[in-house]
């Protein structure tokens, strides 16, 4: 006997109460694939969330975060508080970066300044809480009598030398926090 349910398209469900007739998904629900025996409940974007895309009969709603918060987790499952540049988020709120570290974004952790000397270069521009140091030519290149025929190598992009850097372009990170006691720890809960 052929399974009639496989003929039910997205946006419907196979209704066993009605001899496997394909019934439309009820309001506030959707089915994104064919052959479904139930429709899934639409996500609602309320409170700290705002709607990026309304739920339809074939696709779930998509949420963003309201101003002052940014998405974390797959499909913006959580909204995390923004901090200012030069700060990082801890369990006690936004805290200024310690000396020798910086954060040039509203999210993520403070990271160590680039160590120019490890690459044989000198500090051209000092680092701040908001900006990495800028490395320039090595001290030898700047000494009197040094050949100036060859232009100095361009400084590496801030933050990319000798320590990890994350651009935060994706929403699928779970929070990029250090393991310090006061850093936020995102545990996967039991029944989400």
């Amino acid at each position: 006997l052929q399974d009639l349910c496989s003929n039910c398209p997205a946006g419907t469900f196979c209704d066993n109460n009605r001899s496997q007739i394909c019934s439309p998904c009820p309001p506030n629900s959707f089915s994104s694939a064919g052959g479904q025996r139930t429709c899934d409940i639409c996500r609602q974007c309320k409170g700290v969330f705002k709607t990026r895309k309304e739920c339809s009969s074939t696709s779930n709603a998509e949420c963003d975060c309201i101003s002052g918060y940014h998405c974390l987790g797959a499909e913006c499952s959580m909204c995390e508080q923004d901090c200012k540049q030069g700060q990082e988020l801890t369990k006690k709120g936004c805290k200024d970066c310690c000396f020798g570290t910086f954060n040039d974004q509203k999210r993520g952790i403070c990271r160590p300044w680039t160590n120019c000397s490890l690459d044989g270069k000198s500090v051209l521009v000092n680092g701040t809480k908001e900006r990495d140091v800028v490395c320039g030519p090595s001290p030898a290149d700047l000494s009197p009598g040094a050949s100036s025929a060859t232009p100095p190598a361009p400084a590496r992009e801030p933050g990319h030398h000798h320590h990890h850097h994350h651009d935060y372009k994706d929403d699928d990170d779970k929070g990029d926090y250090k393991d310090d006691d006061d850093k936020i720890d995102y545990k996967d809960d039991d029944d989400k």
Partner: antibody
């Protein structure tokens, strides 16, 4: 499984501030709304306010001027402060976990009775 | 006064089917899903139905929920004496940006 436990004084004098704490055990505070609900003797449920784990708050307009809810993720706790209390604030106070995508309260504390009396 | 309107009481005999109504407006039930809570005397409320008609694990299928427009209802079929309790409807209200409750319905099982 997640459990909630309210704690705080059971007796508060009029005009003082009611302070309650809800401790979350068996799970993370991250990713949820956390609400305070109260129920005066013989009456229905009233939403006081909620806090999202990352600090976003919203309060019932009828209580907004007197309410503060805060969260301490390091202790897995959130707290309620209700100022300038009167006898009308006598109630059982519940803390709840609210699902952040579908907005139902799936975990409730056992409740704590607060009496406002001199 | 509660934002959502429920009858203060309802009753039925064992085995009967009983429904409890919940009326709201376009800013709550009309645009959001409805949840139902069951509360026995001296205990905390318990989630009974969420997202209009979904039952949490452990809730008997005698309990069902539905929603139409700005109203919702809870149906209890095959009524049992242990169903005697208070029932509250609730839902998100867009104008409040928070949840609202009905005043509660006291269900009495007769006989």
């Amino acid at each position: 499984q997640v459990q909630l436990q309210e704690s705080g004084p059971g007796l508060v004098k009029p005009s003082e501030t009611l302070s309650l704490t809800c401790t979350v055990s068996g799970g993370s505070i991250s990713g949820y709304y956390w609400s305070w609900i109260r129920q005066p003797p013989g009456k229905g449920l009233e939403w006081i306010g909620y806090i999202y784990y990352s600090g976003f708050t919203n309060y019932n307009p009828s209580l907004k001027s007197r309410v503060t809810i805060s969260v301490d993720t390091s202790k897995n706790q959130f707290s309620l402060k209700l100022s300038s209390v009167t006898a009308a604030d006598t109630a059982v106070y519940y803390c709840t976990r609210d699902h952040s995508h579908y907005y139902y309260m799936d975990v409730w504390g056992q409740g704590t009775t607060v009496t406002v009396s001199s | 006064q509660s934002v959502l309107t429920q009858p203060p009481s309802a009753s039925g005999t064992p085995g009967q089917r009983v429904t409890i109504s919940c009326s709201g407006s376009s800013s709550n039930i009309g645009s959001n899903t409805v949840n139902w809570y069951q509360q026995f005397p001296g205990t905390a409320p318990k989630l009974l139905i969420y997202s209009n008609n979904q039952r949490p694990s452990g809730v008997p299928d005698r309990f069902s929920g539905s929603k139409s427009g700005t109203s919702a209802s809870l149906a209890i079929s095959g009524l049992q004496s242990e169903d005697e309790a208070d029932y509250y409807c609730a839902g998100w209200d867009d104008s409040l940006n928070g949840p609202v409750f009905g005043g509660g319905t006291k269900l009495t099982v007769l006989g």
